[in-house]
């Protein structure tokens, strides 16, 4: 059933934990509550996952289908250039940013956006599915 569809929820796919969504070889967690960027990162790490790092435009497009206008933290920071938490550069998309003090990245259904890291937003975790 999981292999037969592009994505599925935990109800139809036991290989991701409860409240996580499966897509491809990964599980995604879309939070309901809000935290600042660091707390969101810590939440993901505590669950053997990481704050969302998007690998390509296809994944980004799919994930944006699940999002509303509300921004969600992703594992993207401006540290001498926009980089994902694993150190890889953001290269398949642009991030809307024109403030030098907004150094954390967030995503909604329309775009990647810079924000002050202390703003409380929802977030997305990602991990390899079992």
């Amino acid at each position: 059933l999981c292999q037969g569809s592009k994505y599925s929820t935990c109800a139809s796919c036991p290989s991701c934990p409860d409240h996580w969504m499966k897509y491809g070889n990964h599980c995604y967690y879309f939070s309901v509550e809000k935290k600042d960027w660091i707390s969101s990162l810590e939440f993901c790490l505590a669950r053997d996952s990481h704050l969302l790092m998007i690998t390509d435009k296809q994944e980004m497009s799919l994930l944006q289908d699940f999002l509303s206008e509300a921004f969600h933290w992703v594992g993207l920071r401006n540290n001498s250039g926009w980089r994902w938490e694993d150190g890889s550069p953001l290269n398949f998309s642009r991030i809307y940013s024109n403030s030098l003090v907004q150094t954390c990245g967030a995503i909604n259904k329309n775009s990647l956006q810079a924000s002050s890291c202390e703003v409380s937003l929802q977030w997305v975790c990602k991990k390899v599915s079992p």
Epitope: F71, N98, S99, S115, V119
Partner: antibody, heavy 125, light 112 residues
């Protein structure tokens, strides 16, 4: 490149209403986390925050002047407006608009990275 | 309201000197999120204010490292190494941690 520019009447008489416009470019006031504030500088005195407005139309005012202040925006024209009613000579100052950044509290802000050149306002009878 | 008291109000210096400006707040300005939104601005005659330092000690882009900010709680300091003519003007501290945001009275850095 972010640019802000204030415009106003220059001179007005006591009891009149001061109307100021901040025209900006290089960013959109519909973008999450963006705001514009008004600050004034009376000659020989300290800078004073007056009001600001956020991308989501939340507003905040200096409590001592709140009854006289109104801030608004026209995002389609990239403009923010400030009205100060019933002006007195004490309102004579240079008025600046500045872009403000949201950190989670709509009532305040930080990092005024970009400022306009200022517009001089004199209240005199 | 948070009162920011700057000292001195006037600071005469010779070029090449180090200048130090103090900003004391009437209450602790650590925000509940753990950050301290204390900033320093420079206002030169005929110009608009320029952001120098944000969150106590972070230099804004393009601000030379001769400017440094420090402090915590209620006591903050701006230091300027080797003062040059272009550094002269009025320095203001500002806090955005508490409502309403407030400025200090300013410190005029001028030549002796």
């Amino acid at each position: 490149q972010v640019i802000l520019k204030e415009s106003g009447p220059g001179i007005l008489q006591p009891s009149q209403t001061l109307s100021l416009t901040c025209s900006f470019s290089g960013f959109s006031l519909t973008t999450f986390g963006m705001g514009i504030g008004w600050i004034r500088h009376p000659s020989g005195k300290a800078l004073e925050w007056l009001a600001h407005i956020w991308w989501n139309d939340d507003k905040s005012y200096n409590s001592a002047l709140k009854s006289r202040l109104t801030i608004s925006k026209d995002t389609s024209k990239n403009q923010v407006f400030l009205r100060l009613a019933n002006v007195a000579t004490a309102d004579t100052a240079t008025y600046y608009c500045a872009r403000t950044i949201y950190y989670g509290n709509y009532l305040t802000f930080y990092a005024m990275e970009h400022w306009g050149q200022g517009t001089s306002v004199t209240v005199s009878s | 309201d948070v009162l920011l008291t700057q000292t001195p109000l006037s600071l005469p210096v010779s070029l090449g000197d180090q200048a130090s400006i103090s900003c004391r707040s009437s209450q602790n300005i650590v925000h509940s999120n753990g950050n301290t939104y204390l900033e320093w601005y420079l206002l030169k005659p005929g110009q608009s204010p320029k952001l120098l330092i944000f969150k106590v000690s972070n230099r804004f882009s393009g601000v030379p490292d001769k400017f440094s900010g420090s402090g915590s709680g209620t006591d903050f300091t701006l230091k300027i190494r080797r003062v040059e003519a272009e550094d002269l003007g009025i320095y203001y501290c500002f806090q955005g941690s508490h409502v309403p945001p407030t400025f200090g009275a300013g410190t005029k850095l001028e030549l002796k």
